[in-house]
């Protein structure tokens, strides 16, 4: 019995269906096919879980969280024992193993391994201003999404004709910050932060209004 090499990893957007491949070749008839799909969750690597099982002509459910979401892609018994996972959740991310036995065929590699990564687009980021908006002050524009896998990058732009940040601004796309030093009237305006990763983007807006000192009355 020989389980075919897997592609290594599968990536899928949260809520979509993932297909985890596993196929094998055997010299024996499929009279006593035994297939066990296990997962080592990324969130809890020392707690492997059963996903779905096929034994003695019957299918058995795995862990409760997979109930109603998992099945074999084809009619069993078969040499293609790939499974699907519907409505993928972040917690489904992990290393999946298919263990195949088909007596009396012994020997060979009977385990296939496939990684599953559930991707999450950035959630709507929060835009904030840190620091005084008085003329000549330094301000930091903050942008952060609570969710996003892979981790989002953040791009700030000023919504004017140029879409360029003020010349005194420095941007950190990983942290999602823009530091604007010595703000002036030209710094005022609408700023947009775009949070993006491999599967999506999300934006927030921030209105920076530089406060000029009031002329003193005599």
């Amino acid at each position: 019995l020989e389980v075919s090499e897997s592609p290594g990893s599968v990536q899928v957007a949260r809520g979509q269906t993932a297909v985890l491949p596993c196929a094998f070749s055997t010299s024996a008839a499929l009279l006593n096919l035994n297939v066990i799909w296990m997962v080592i969750p990324l969130s809890n690597a020392n707690q492997p879980e059963q996903v779905i099982l096929y034994q003695g002509g019957q299918m058995f459910d795995g862990a409760l969280r997979f109930h109603g979401r998992v099945g074999f892609t084809g009619t069993m018994p078969a040499t293609n024992v790939s499974i699907f996972i519907n409505n993928t959740q972040l917690s489904d991310t992990g290393t999946y193993q298919c263990l195949v036995n088909n007596l009396p065929d012994r020997g060979g590699r009977n385990i296939g391994v496939t990684g599953l990564t559930v991707l999450v687009p950035p959630s709507a980021p929060q835009c904030q201003i840190q620091g005084s908006q008085d003329l000549g002050s330094d301000v930091i524009l903050l942008c952060s999404s609570e969710e996003g896998i892979p981790r989002p990058t953040y791009l700030w732009e000023k919504l004017d004709n140029t879409l360029k940040l003020p010349p005194t601004a420095t941007q950190d796309q990983v942290q999602g910050t823009v530091t604007i030093r010595n703000i002036s009237a030209l710094s005022s305006g609408l700023y947009q932060c775009v949070a993006s990763n491999a599967i999506g983007t999300s934006t927030c807006l921030l209105d920076l209004q530089v406060i000029s000192p009031q002329p003193r009355s005599v």
């Epitope: 034994q55 003695g56 019957q58 058995f60 459910d61 009396p104």
Partner: antibody, heavy 126, light 107 residues
Framework: EVQLVESGGGLVKPGGSLRLSCAAS????????MNWVRQAPGKGLEWVSS????????YYADSVKGRFTISRDNAKNSLYLQMNSLRAEDTAVYYC???????????????????WGQGTMVTVSS | EIVLTQSPSSLSASVGDRVTITCRAS??????LNWYQLKPGKAPKLLIY???ILQSGVPSRFSGSGSGTDFTLTISSLQPEDFAAYYC?????????FGQGTKLEIK
């Protein structure tokens, strides 16, 4: 204490219907497949039906296919067997049994009926 | 379907005896065989699974052996509580099937 208690048996005429129940306690019912097994008077055991923990997969013996329906309610920790078009040969003690997947060898599994109820008698007679 | 044939159908023995019950499958079932004990009015009990593995809580006087088509259940030294009916059952294929049973009686 892990326990299965069957109920609903009784005397019924041929062609009639009966619904058996099995109340589970002492274990996480929703994590196990469940089975009905019967024993006719003076005969051996006969597997009747099984249902997976999520109710996704259901299996029947040929002798009851199309007449019996197995179901479960995980919220109520209960297993059921709806028996229609009953025949004299369905007369038996009906047991509910928990299906347990047990590891053996390097990576092999076997399912066994590891917890049983005491049974309920079903008599089909005119 | 796989047919399991148990022998003997009934057996008389005394406390302290060594008893062997056999179960033969109509085709090879590897080690996919379980043994159960049945007593009237009581819940049946799983004794051995996968032909030879003792279920938790079962006394060590019970043992199982065999593979393929021929299996045995042995009780090394009969105790009064062992007088009951014994059944083998295969989980190799669907439908799951049982042997016809062996009734163990006091001599």
């Amino acid at each position: 204490e892990v326990q299965l208690v069957e109920s609903g048996g009784g005397l019924v005429k041929p062609g009639g219907s009966l619904r058996l129940s099995c109340a589970a306690s002492g274990f996480t019912f929703s994590s196990y497949s469940m089975n009905w097994v019967r024993q006719a008077p003076g005969k051996g055991l006969e597997w009747v039906s099984s249902i997976s923990s999520s109710s996704s997969y259901i299996y029947y013996a040929d002798s009851v296919k199309g007449r019996f329906t197995i179901s479960r309610d995980n919220a109520k920790n209960s297993l059921y067997l709806q028996m229609n078009s009953l025949r004299a040969e369905d007369t038996a003690v009906y047991y509910c049994a928990r299906g347990q997947l047990l590891w053996f060898g390097e990576s092999a599994l076997i399912d066994a009926f590891d917890i049983w109820g005491q049974g309920t008698m079903v008599t089909v007679s005119s | 379907e796989i047919v399991l044939t148990q022998s003997p159908s009934s057996l008389s023995a005394s406390v302290g005896d060594r008893v062997t019950i056999t179960c033969r499958a109509s085709q090879s079932i590897s080690s996919y065989l379980n043994w159960y004990q049945l007593k009237p009015g009581k819940a049946p009990k799983l004794l051995i699974y996968a032909a030879s593995i003792l279920q938790s809580g079962v006394p060590s006087r019970f043992s199982g052996s065999g593979s393929g088509t021929d299996f045995t259940l042995t009780i090394s030294s009969l105790q009064p509580e062992d007088f009951a009916a014994y059944y083998c059952q295969q989980s190799y294929s669907t439908p799951r099937t049982f042997g016809q049973g062996t009734k163990l009686e006091i001599k």
